[in-house]
Every structure is written in structure tokens, then in C-alpha cells.
Amino acid sequence: AFGISGVQKYTRALHDSSITGISPITEYLASLSTYNDQSITFALEDESYEIYVEDLKKDEKKDKVLLSYYESQHPSNESGDGVDGKMLMVTLSPTKDFWLHANNKEHSVELHKCEKPLPDQAFFVLHNMHSNCVSFECKTDPGVFIGVKDNHLALIKVDSSENLCTENILFKLSET
């Protein structure tokens, strides 16, 4: 493993990375669930959307989220061409014109209505910690991931490589 500095090293230039092109390279409609198979659901309450983490009843339909994948160039630290590879950034939209946003001050994940171009707070770096699990790292706050806290989505600081595989920041994407 690579210790605390490893996470910081991975993400040190995240906020400097530039998204190449304004259109996504692909889009994917999927349901989002936690590592423990709880569903992420979205409910309209008092003209704003709330995000819940809950067990669904047997035949209850899962909410779908549109994931838009964007390519992002990462500034170089060692390669001669100025770019040290590409990252995948995603935006997550459960319903038209609404996107998940990172509220770094409140350490919360919120649904905001906004127009394109989307703000940086709506972009998350996609990580595969396992072959069938993904994690979402804030573009605006390297080392901070979407996670589950008290049956809600929250922003969780990951300060060591061991914690990158913590179950509460792992999510499953499913087409069903």
C-alpha cells in the first residue's frame, strides 16, 4: 500500500485537471446502490429533491441515474508531454436538469437544478476499487468521496489508501 501521501499524491492536481470537450464521451443510465445493496433514491419534497439510502421492498422499482462520462487530462509530474494520463469524470443526474453536487462546506451531497456548463461541484472522478464497485471523488476537493452516513449521502474524507476500500464509499451500478 502507499500510505497517506499516496492519496494526496493521486489527487493533488485534481482541481487543475481540464475536461476535454464539453460533451460526454458516453452516457449510462443505471440504478445506484451501496456496497450493502441499499438503494439510492430521490424524492421530491417541498419543490426540492431529497436523497435517501434505503432498503427497497421486494418489487419496488429502483430509481435510475444518468451518468455522463467526461474525459479529463491530468497535468504531468513526470512525463514530457505535459499530460500524465486521463481520468474519467462523471456527473450524476436522477432527473432532468438536476445534478448531484458536492457541498464541501457542509460535507453534504445535494441535488441542484442548473444549466450547462455544469459547475465543478457537479463533477466526480470515477474510481474502481473493485471490479464491480465504483467510488466518486470530488473534483473540487481531492481525497473527498461521496459516501453513506446515517442513511444519507455525505462527503467523506479519505486520508489513507486503506480507507479507499471502505465500504461506505463503494457503490454498485446496475442497469436493472
Epitope: A1, F2, Y10, Y28, G85, K86, L88, H127, M129
Partner: antibody, heavy 122, light 107 residues
């Protein structure tokens, strides 16, 4: 320039062991998933093993599970494939490959080594 | 496991011809589909990823399309240097699987 250089191939008897190495350079090694792919003489490509960028997860097809072990040493920017209980059907060129993007598996394998030949024969 | 069936297994076409290779998946998946070119004695080369994205440095005569279970690689105008074997590969579900390959020759 991204470079992947495999070594460690050779002739080995059935039941024997071999360790392949892949020396990586030109990129930040510990940001990428790495994968081994093999190709038997005159045949197609077969995925053999993958390891997460953290090194915390490893994946294999049934054909090699329990016999092959993928590992990485980020301090040396080197990928390994330990092959035990080798069989004649493991005879192939073994390629080391790198994922397309930081941190995840999406997007195929844009970088391949030159390959190292493993021959299992008595 | 997702089986990837490529067709045809081989083809012969004239320089300048439009060539189409198909890859049929045994079950649907997201578009994490790549195409590779492999020349004799060489390592494979990534041509297309995300089903339709052209890898840097690959000539624009190569294109990819498709989703779900049906994917296509097209060479709009076959060139002598395109003689090779072409493979599709799905990266959506483990185990990762490749198609059996399509050998392309010049008439």
C-alpha cells in the same frame, strides 16, 4: 513515453513455476489498474489477470484461478505474474497491459508490452 | 460470462473497399467495448474504446458503433497497412472477454 517491458518467460516443465515481470515507465504506475493478457500460438487473446490501482483487488478467469497470482510493487513500478502448476495449455505469449484511465477499468488497454513467451513442455 | 462472437472470422477485400466487422455479445452491457488491431508478430494496438471513441493517433478511416449486444468496427477505405487480425473486447463485466478475431487480407 509509456513503456511496458516483460521478462521472465522461457521453457518450463508441466507442473513447474515461473514468475513474469513487467517493468513500467513513462507514467505514474500506481494510478492505474494493470492487466495480463496471453495469446497461445496461432490463437486469439485471453484475459489472464487484473489488479486494482491500489493493489487491494485481484481478478482471474477460472482457467488460471488458484494457479496464477498477479501482484505489483509500486516502489519499483513493476507488475508480476506468479504462475504455478503450469500446464501445456498455458503455453503462450504473455502481455502486460495498462488501463486507459487513472483509477478505473473503463476504456480498454492502450498500452501493451512486447510480450514474453512461456513454453510449457516436457 | 459474456461471450463475444466476431464475424466474419476472415475476409478478403480490395484496397479502398469499405470493411465491416461485427461483434455480438451474449448479453447486453454498457458500452465498454474496445477494438484492437494486431499485425503478425506484433502486440495488439487499441483502435477504438467506449464503442466509438477513436484512440489517439489512429487514422480516421477506422470507426466504431453499436450498443447493448451489437457492435461494429468499420474501415471506410481499406489500406494495405490494415492487413491484420482485429479483436473486440468487453470491459463491462468480469471475466473480461475477447472476440475470436477477424483476419483481414487484401484481394
Amino acid at each position: 513515453e509509456v513503456q511496458l517491458v516483460e521478462s521472465g518467460g522461457g521453457l518450463v516443465q508441466p507442473g513447474g513455476s515461473l514468475r513474469l515481470s513487467c517493468a513500467a515507465s513513462g507514467f505514474t504506475f500506481n494510478n492505474y489498474w494493470m492487466t495480463w493478457v496471453r495469446q497461445a500460438p496461432g490463437k486469439g487473446l485471453e484475459w489472464i489477470a487484473s489488479i486494482t490501482y491500489t493493489g487491494g483487488g485481484t481478478y482471474y478467469p477460472d482457467s488460471v484461478k488458484g494457479r496464477f497470482t498477479i501482484s505489483r510493487d509500486d516502489s519499483k513500478s513493476t507488475l508480476y505474474l506468479q504462475m504455478n502448476s503450469l500446464r501445456a495449455e498455458d503455453t503462450a505469449v504473455y502481455y502486460c497491459t495498462r488501463a486507459n484511465y487513472y483509477y478505473n477499468t473503463y476504456g480498454g488497454f492502450p498500452y501493451w508490452g512486447q510480450g514474453t513467451l512461456v513454453t510449457v513442455s516436457s | 460470462d459474456i461471450q463475444m462472437t466476431q464475424s466474419p472470422s476472415s475476409l478478403s477485400a480490395s484496397v479502398g473497399d469499405r470493411v465491416t466487422i461485427t461483434c455480438l455479445a451474449s448479453e447486453g452491457f454498457s458500452n465498454d467495448l474496445a477494438w484492437y488491431q494486431q499485425k503478425p508478430g506484433k502486440s495488439p494496438k487499441l483502435l477504438i474504446y467506449a464503442a466509438s471513441r477513436l484512440q489517439d493517433g489512429v487514422p480516421s478511416r477506422f470507426s466504431g458503433s453499436g450498443s447493448g449486444t451489437d457492435f461494429t468496427l468499420t474501415i471506410s477505405s481499406l489500406q494495405p497497412e490494415d492487413v491484420a487480425t482485429y479483436y473486440c473486447q468487453q470491459g463491462s463485466k468480469y471475466p473480461l472477454t475477447f472476440g475470436g478475431g477477424t483476419k483481414v487480407e487484401i484481394k
